[in-house]
């Protein structure tokens, strides 16, 4: 014997109180598959969550985060506050990255500057709270004849002879 409820399409539920008639989902509820005996309550996007897609009788609402926050988790199950570049979110709110660390995004944690010397390279551009250091050629590469590419000569103040 076929279950009469299997004929109920998405957007309806099989109403046991009415001889298993297919009844439309009540307001603020949905069923995304056929044959359901109940409709699910629609997700509500409240507070820092805002509605990206309205709930319909056949699909749940979808939320994203209000400006100043970003989604975390599957289906944007959490909203986390943004910080500025050069900061990270701590238990005391957004805090500047400590010296020697950087964050080039509005989310995530401060990460240590690259240690150029581990790769045998020199620091070409110093790091900041917002940017990693830029590693340059290794000191060996800077010795005469080591490379066909000549690095730019450092600028000198007038009247100063090279060391």
């Amino acid at each position: 014997l076929q279950d009469p409820c299997s004929n109920c399409p998405a957007g309806t539920f099989c109403d046991n109180n009415r001889n298993q008639i297919c009844s439309p989902c009540p307001p603020n509820s949905f069923s995304s598959a056929g044959g359901q005996r109940t409709c699910d309550i629609c997700r509500q996007c409240k507070g820092v969550f805002r509605t990206r897609k309205e709930c319909s009788s056949t699909s749940n609402a979808e939320c994203d985060c209000t400006p100043g926050f970003h989604c975390l988790g599957a289906g944007c199950s959490m909203c986390e506050q943004d910080c500025k570049q050069g900061q990270e979110l701590t238990k005391k709110g957004c805090k500047d990255c400590c010296f020697g660390t950087f964050n080039d995004q509005k989310r995530g944690i401060c990460r240590p500057w690259t240690n150029c010397s581990l790769d045998g390279k020199s620091v070409l551009v110093n790091g900041t709270k917002e940017r990693d250091v830029v590693c340059g050629p290794s000191p060996a590469d800077l010795s005469p004849g080591a490379s066909s590419v000549t690095p730019p000569a450092p600028a000198r103040e007038p009247g100063h002879s090279p060391q």
């Epitope: 409240k46 507070g47 820092v48 939320c63 975390l72 959490m78 909203c79 979110l89 709110g93 957004c94």
Partner: nanobody
């Protein structure tokens, strides 16, 4: 049904004080962490303060020393005492549950009040 109702907002002069209240019903308040957030006109939402069920508190840097969050479990109410108010504190203040226990992070299952407007102006 869960309900969070904020009150206590209004117009206050710079340097003045206000106490916001958030009356909670429909869930076990005493074991729930609570938070306040705000949204200034034309600005983004901002986490302001949070309080654990134990009473431990956290504040955004800009309000530290001026705002005090507290709770009365007997009255199912969380408060935000605001003093030395500045024009930049003008915002709608929202009370919310705080299930993540992570500063500046809210879960989809958190409950929110409708907000109360605080205007700081001379």
């Amino acid at each position: 049904e869960v309900d969070l109702v904020e009150s206590g907002g209004g117009l206050v002069q710079p340097g003045g004080s206000l106490r916001l209240s958030c009356a909670v019903s429909g869930f076990t308040f005493s074991s729930s962490a609570m938070s306040w957030a705000r949204q200034a006109p034309g600005k983004e939402f901002e986490w302001v303060s949070s309080i654990y069920s134990s009473g431990k508190t956290y504040y955004v840097e800009s309000v530290k020393g001026r705002f005090t969050i507290s709770r009365d479990n007997a009255k199912n109410t969380v408060y935000l005492q605001m003093s030395s108010l500045r024009p930049e504190d003008t915002a709608v203040y929202y009370c919310a549950t705080w299930k993540t226990l992570r500063v500046g992070v809210w879960d989809e299952s958190d409950y929110w009040g409708q907000g109360t407007l605080v205007t700081v102006s001379s």
